[in-house]
């Protein structure tokens, strides 16, 4: 992620900052979203509770080929302590349940917000 | 368009309870927190607390903590205000509020864009 | 608790002149993440309340420009630059930076 710190003084990005930047980008995917996101490819849902972003980069690192997500895939890495690969799962998704790229992104997207809005940011 | 319809007026006796409902129309309440504030006659408003109908997550006034309960029910659309062990300063008019998230700015206003109504809550014996 | 207090508490203004409300915070509202969530709310006679003003200085959609917010910190001011007659009401400002969130109390608005 970018560094914010004064030139003097380089330093992470404030958590506030990264959680915000990471807002942006799921908005710009909402806003230029012409033909179906990923072409309409299907992602595990997951329970957004604590431990949510692993579980966000989980089931987005599955979607190959589509660069509309990859920014995303890299952000949510930055806020997940552990390395995560295709294929893995945590007991955050709710695996009998798939839905599309586009509402999996408005979804969380909707829930950073509120995170946002409440002061939660790691 | 956006709608916020509130139940009908209650006259309650002390040490009950009234349950005010809010419906939700023109927007999913799940995309929202609901509030509820509140206005005793000829006072001004008083904010009692707030909803995230997506998880049920609330957040109470300390002074109302333990005698109010804020619900929301998704699949219908409503939010709820009970208050509990009524005393004659709850007289008050109740309204519900929303706060609205979207799709489309990174950093959306938050602040209480519709209002219901209100509902007029008298106690008295 | 922060108590956010108003002033003046009764405002007769002329139409057509210039009407300003002070509203302060008894501690700073800047929010964790950075915004400060300073609002302004007008609640005409006999209806519910309405946004005017959120973010200390945006203004509502269908507000007119002659609403405007600005202050910092602790101290905010509601200008209206011209007032007409349909602006009588109760002017409140509100903090949605802390839990308890607050509103002052109140500002009404009278044509002289």
């Known amino acids: 992620l970018t560094c914010l710190g004064g030139f003097a003084s380089p330093g992470p990005v404030p958590p506030s900052t990264a959680l915000r930047e990471l807002i942006e980008e799921l908005v710009n995917i909402t806003q230029n979203q012409k033909a179906p996101l990923c072409n309409g490819s299907m992602v595990w849902s997951i329970n957004l509770t604590a431990g949510m972003y692993c579980a966000a980069l989980e089931s987005l690192i599955n979607v190959s080929g589509c660069s509309a997500i990859e920014k995303t895939q890299r952000m949510l890495s930055g806020f997940c302590p552990h390395k995560v690969s295709a294929g893995q799962f945590s007991s955050l998704h709710v695996r009998d349940t798939k839905i599309e790229v586009a509402q999996f992104v408005k979804d969380l997207l909707l829930h950073l917000k509120k995170l946002f809005r409440e002061g939660q940011f790691n | 368009q956006v709608q916020l319809v509130q139940s009908g007026a209650e006259v309650k006796k002390p040490g009950s309870s009234v349950k005010v409902s809010c419906k939700a129309s023109?927007?999913?309440?799940?995309?929202?927190?609901m509030h509820w504030v509140r206005q005793a006659p000829g006072q001004g408003l008083e904010w009692m607390g707030t909803?995230?109908?997506?998880?049920?997550?609330?957040k109470y006034v300390p002074k109302f903590q333990g005698r109010v309960t804020i619900t929301a029910d998704e699949s219908t659309s409503t939010a709820y205000m009970e208050l509990s062990s009524l005393r004659s300063e709850d007289t008050a008019v109740y309204y519900c509020?929303?706060?609205?998230?979207?799709?489309?700015?990174?950093?959306?206003?938050?602040?209480?864009?519709?209002w219901g109504q209100g509902t007029l809550v008298t106690v008295s014996s | 608790d922060i108590v956010m207090t108003q002033s003046p508490l009764s405002l007769p203004v002329t139409p057509g002149e210039p009407a300003s409300i002070s509203c302060r915070s008894s501690?700073?509202?800047?929010?964790?993440?950075?915004?400060?969530?300073l609002e302004w709310y007008l609640q005409k006679p006999g209806q519910s309340p309405r946004l005017l003003i959120y973010k200390i200085s945006d203004r509502f959609s269908g507000v007119p420009d002659r609403f405007s917010g600005s202050g910092s910190g602790t101290d905010f001011t509601l200008k209206i630059s011209r007032v007409e007659a349909d602006d009588v009401g109760i002017y409140y400002c509100?903090?949605?930076?802390?839990?308890?969130?607050?509103f002052g109390q109140g500002t009404k608005l009278e044509i002289k």
């Open positions: 909803i995230d109908p997506a998880n049920g997550n609330t």
């Open positions: 509100f903090q949605g930076s802390h839990v308890p969130w607050t």
């Open positions: 501690q700073n509202i800047v929010h964790i993440n950075g915004n400060t969530y």
């Open positions: 023109g927007f999913y309440i799940k995309d929202t927190y």
């Open positions: 509020a929303r706060s609205i998230y979207d799709d489309y700015h990174w950093d959306d206003y938050y602040a209480m864009d519709y």
